[in-house]
């Protein structure tokens, strides 16, 4: 039994790091393998992760961590019974994939403005809480070409857009994801999408003089 692709890990910089690897043949990861991990620090204990299968020869393990600081370094040992298959280390702060934002809501109660809000996936004591920026993806269910991304580079988890920038009378979906420049993270997964019906009334003057204006965006 050999490791074909060495473990690579990403951290949510809060409580979970996920490591994936491939074996040289079909493997029952949970019965045949164990990934031992230990924070390189005083009093730290070794922990055992039981991997799950991820395709025929692939394995994935979710390493649970109490907290994380920038300087953290973990030793990783992959065992098959008494045989050490691979030994490595992992610095969570160098391989961060943020948690996905949640609770995406579209507020349509102001006729000419759409307000999208979502929740920061981190608690205030986490460094990433004040360092996330977001990308909001809005698309039309009717028209695949009507697909847009808004970059939210301020810290507030919200986005205001004029309803008139979208077509009226059709359904749209939105989703949001996060990243943090400070740790050069990858993007998070997208949040679950939310759906709304876009309808707005053009001002009378605009309707009278520029009836087709909004079709030209």
């Amino acid at each position: 039994m050999k490791v074909l692709q060495e473990p690579t890990c990403v951290s949510d910089y809060m409580s979970i790091s996920t490591c994936e690897w491939k074996m040289n043949g079909p493997t029952n990861c949970s019965t045949e393998l164990r990934l031992l991990y230990q924070l390189v620090f005083l009093l730290s204990e070794a922990h055992t992760c039981i991997p799950e299968n991820n395709g025929g020869a692939g394995c994935v393990c979710h390493l649970l961590m109490d907290d994380v600081v920038s300087a953290d370094n973990y030793t990783l040992d992959l065992w098959a019974g008494q045989q050490l298959l691979w030994k490595g280390s992992f610095k969570p702060s160098e391989h961060v994939k943020p948690r996905a934002p949640g609770n995406l809501t579209v507020h349509t109660n102001v006729s000419d403005t759409l307000l999208l809000t979502w929740s920061n996936p981190y608690p205030p004591d986490n460094y990433l809480y004040n360092h996330l920026t977001y990308a909001v993806n809005i698309w039309s269910e009717n028209d695949p070409a009507d697909f847009r991304i808004y970059n939210v580079t301020y810290l507030e988890p919200s986005l205001r857009i004029a309803a008139s920038t979208l077509k009226s009378g059709i359904s749209y979906r939105a989703r949001v994801r996060a990243w943090a420049q400070c740790y050069n993270t990858t993007w998070s997964e997208w949040s679950p999408s939310t759906k709304w019906h876009n309808s707005y009334r053009e001002p009378f003057e605009q309707h009278h003089h520029h009836h087709h204006h909004h079709h030209h965006h």
């Epitope: 409580s15 620090f41 109490d66 600081v69 608690p123 460094y127």
Partner: antibody, heavy 116, light 112 residues
């Protein structure tokens, strides 16, 4: 041996500023969060705030926001807390504590007395 | 802020007898990562506090096994199975799950 050694007792006048230090040995402060805890005379423990020494990220209890400023110097392995606009109510013992992820190591405490 | 309320505030126990201290949080202290960071500290007279129990039930290294922690949700308990003279001092519960972190008001244990 792991130790947190704090600077000595201070007596200050109201309105003054004091900066107390906490030097760690036996471990690197970059590997922990460094916290400060207040203990007023004859009273209990109150959490002041904390710092991640590597990136300087601080959080404070609202009571100490604007009153306490926590800093760290990783080259000297030392954490600091500055208390400004001192009042008699700030008279207390202040403990530095390393947390990873519990308060395993405490400094001996620094008594700050505010008196005119 | 989460308020940690300890009862009783003082306790007088005969050596060899058990002691129990209760700590109630004003709301759940389960962290977003699923862990409950409820700890117990003992401050002996003239000393800095020392860690006894972390994550509700785990004894810190070197802590005698007569100390045990239990509880979940918002109700937690520290038990000393047989009190010894060296156990005197003030016991504090602490929650490190939600900012601002908070201590209980302390329970003073003395020997009869």
């Amino acid at each position: 041996e792991v130790q947190l050694v704090q600077s000595g007792a201070e007596v200050k006048k109201p309105g003054a500023t004091v900066k107390i230090s906490c030097k760690a040995s036996g471990f690197n402060i970059k590997d922990t969060y460094m916290h400060w805890v207040q203990q007023a005379p004859g009273k209990g423990l109150e959490w002041v705030g904390r710092i991640d020494p590597t990136n300087g990220y601080t959080i404070y209890a609202s009571k100490f926001q604007g009153k306490a400023t926590i800093t760290a110097d990783t080259s000297s392995n030392t954490a600091y807390m500055e208390l400004s606009s001192l009042r008699s109510e700030d008279t207390a013992v202040y403990h530095c504590v390393s947390r990873r992820p519990w308060f395993a190591y405490w400094g001996q405490g620094t008594l700050v007395t505010v008196s005119s | 802020d989460i308020v940690m309320t300890q009862t009783p505030l003082s306790l007088s126990v005969t050596p060899g007898q058990p002691a129990s201290i209760s700590c109630r949080s004003s709301q759940s202290i389960v962290h977003s990562n699923g862990n409950t960071y409820l700890e117990w500290y003992l401050q002996k007279p003239g000393q800095s506090p020392q860690l006894l129990i972390y994550k509700v039930t785990n004894r810190f290294s070197g802590v005698p096994d007569r100390f045990s922690g239990s509880g979940s949700g918002t109700d937690f308990t520290l038990k000393i199975s047989r009190v010894e003279a060296e156990d005197v001092g003030v016991y504090y519960c602490f929650q490190g799950s939600h900012v601002p972190y908070t201590f209980g008001q302390g329970t003073k244990l003395e020997i009869k």
